[in-house]
């Protein structure tokens, strides 16, 4: 026994909107079109967006999203109370902070209300899906004549839960120097050249103590230190993402 899936070979490895031509064993009902995948991210532990590609539906369909946690007093699914829309069709759900339980298995069900048998249930570890806000309030101070310290702040998330990526370069550098800083929102550069102008920026992720998120935050606003007179090639300051 085997099943067939029609898909374009160019996207063989990642094509998600599959067309089922035969279905699982002992299922005698007519095959149904698979639903789009739901992707969830928890933004700074303030709210969560669970979204799907509504344009993958052959006809405009207002899919519904229900969710629950694996271990909870009320084990029934609750429907999304704040849908996100794309071209007037549901394409996501925003879940507020009080409904987020980072360390319980999150169970999410997407369903076609016109065809109740068309449903998909996914399970997610939310602690691996946290995206922090960009670090803020970057400040530079001189620890000594040639030593600089960079400090920053992160809102709403405990510092010990975050890992930081610091990038810096001088106006003489063509590429960034980068390093990982764990849990401490500070970094010191032991030797700086006062004739150069330095640019620093930082981003963070929820890893590895409290979660295993691979997603970095956006970059902080850059901060600068040093001479403003030696800018040989201003184009070097274009910050690539």
């Amino acid at each position: 026994w085997s099943s067939k899936v029609l898909m374009s070979s160019a996207n063989e490895d990642i094509k998600a909107d599959l067309i089922l031509t035969s279905t699982a064993p002992e299922h005698l009902s007519a095959p149904t079109l698979p639903l789009p995948e739901v992707q969830c991210f928890v933004f700074n532990i303030e709210y969560m967006n669970c979204t799907w590609n509504s344009s993958s539906e052959p006809q405009a369909t207002n899919l519904t999203l229900h969710y629950r946690y694996k271990v909870s007093d009320n084990n029934t699914f609750q429907e999304c109370s704040h849908y996100l829309f794309s071209k007037e069709i549901t394409s996501g759900c925003q879940i507020q902070k009080e409904d987020i339980q980072l360390y319980q298995t999150f169970v999410v069900q997407l369903q076609d209300p016109q065809k109740p048998q068309r449903r998909a249930v996914q399970k997610l570890n939310l602690q691996n899906l946290v995206i922090p806000r960009a670090p803020e309030n970057l400040t530079l101070s001189n620890l000594s004549e040639s030593q600089l310290e960079l400090r920053w702040k992160s809102r709403h998330i405990k510092e010990r839960c975050l890992q930081y990526l610091v990038q810096y370069r001088s106006n003489r550098d063509r590429s960034w120097t980068e390093l990982i800083v764990n849990h401490e929102p500070r970094f010191s550069l032991p030797s700086v050249d006062e004739l150069k102008r330095y640019t620093f920026r930082v981003r963070s992720r929820y890893n590895p103590i409290c979660g295993s998120s691979q997603q970095w935050s956006k970059w902080s606003q850059p901060v600068h230190w040093g001479s403003h007179t030696v800018e040989e090639n201003p184009s070097l300051f274009a910050l690539e993402a």
Epitope: I14, A16, L18, E37, R119, K123
Partner: nanobody, 126 residues
Framework: EVQLVESGGGLVQAGDSLRLSCVAS????????MGWFRKAPGKEREYVAI???????FYEDSVEGRFTFSRDNAKNTVYLQMNSLRPEDTAVYYC????????????????????WGQGTQVTVSS
């Protein structure tokens, strides 16, 4: 055409162990959500263990702590290590695959899987 072939089933005593294997041919499993499901006579099919290609794995409550899902992408194979087997684990065990875009997708709904194996019988006697 994708083929999933399970093996490793058999007749064992309660408390024994078995390791099921599922080998895929025709495409790589490296970007597939995978699932092990089982169907006992007169019962609904249920998921046993499901896994995203990013590595998140979830187990049905009754097997948590006894069964372990693993995958070997180099061999295009997934495994289900079953320890401390009980008579109620008796069923036909199926391996299923769903190509996915996202590393975090793990499906517990059987109709989300595109590819299925033919099943392997596991019988646990008391």
């Amino acid at each position: 055409e994708v083929q999933l072939v399970e093996s490793g089933g058999g007749l064992v005593q309660a408390g024994d162990s078995l390791r099921l294997s599922c080998v895929a041919s025709g495409r790589t499993l490296s970007r597939c959500a995978m699932g092990w499901f089982r169907k006992a006579p007169g019962k609904e099919r249920e998921y046993v263990a499901i896994s995203s290609w990013g590595g998140d794995t979830f187990y049905e409550d009754s097997v948590e702590g006894r069964f372990t899902f693993s995958r070997d992408n180099a061999k295009n194979t997934v495994y289900l290590q079953m320890n401390s087997l009980r008579p109620e684990d008796t069923a036909v065990y199926y391996c299923a695959a769903a190509p996915t875009s996202f590393a975090t997708t793990a499906y517990s709904s059987s109709n989300s899987y595109a590819y299925w194996g033919q099943g392997t019988q596991v019988t646990v006697s008391s």
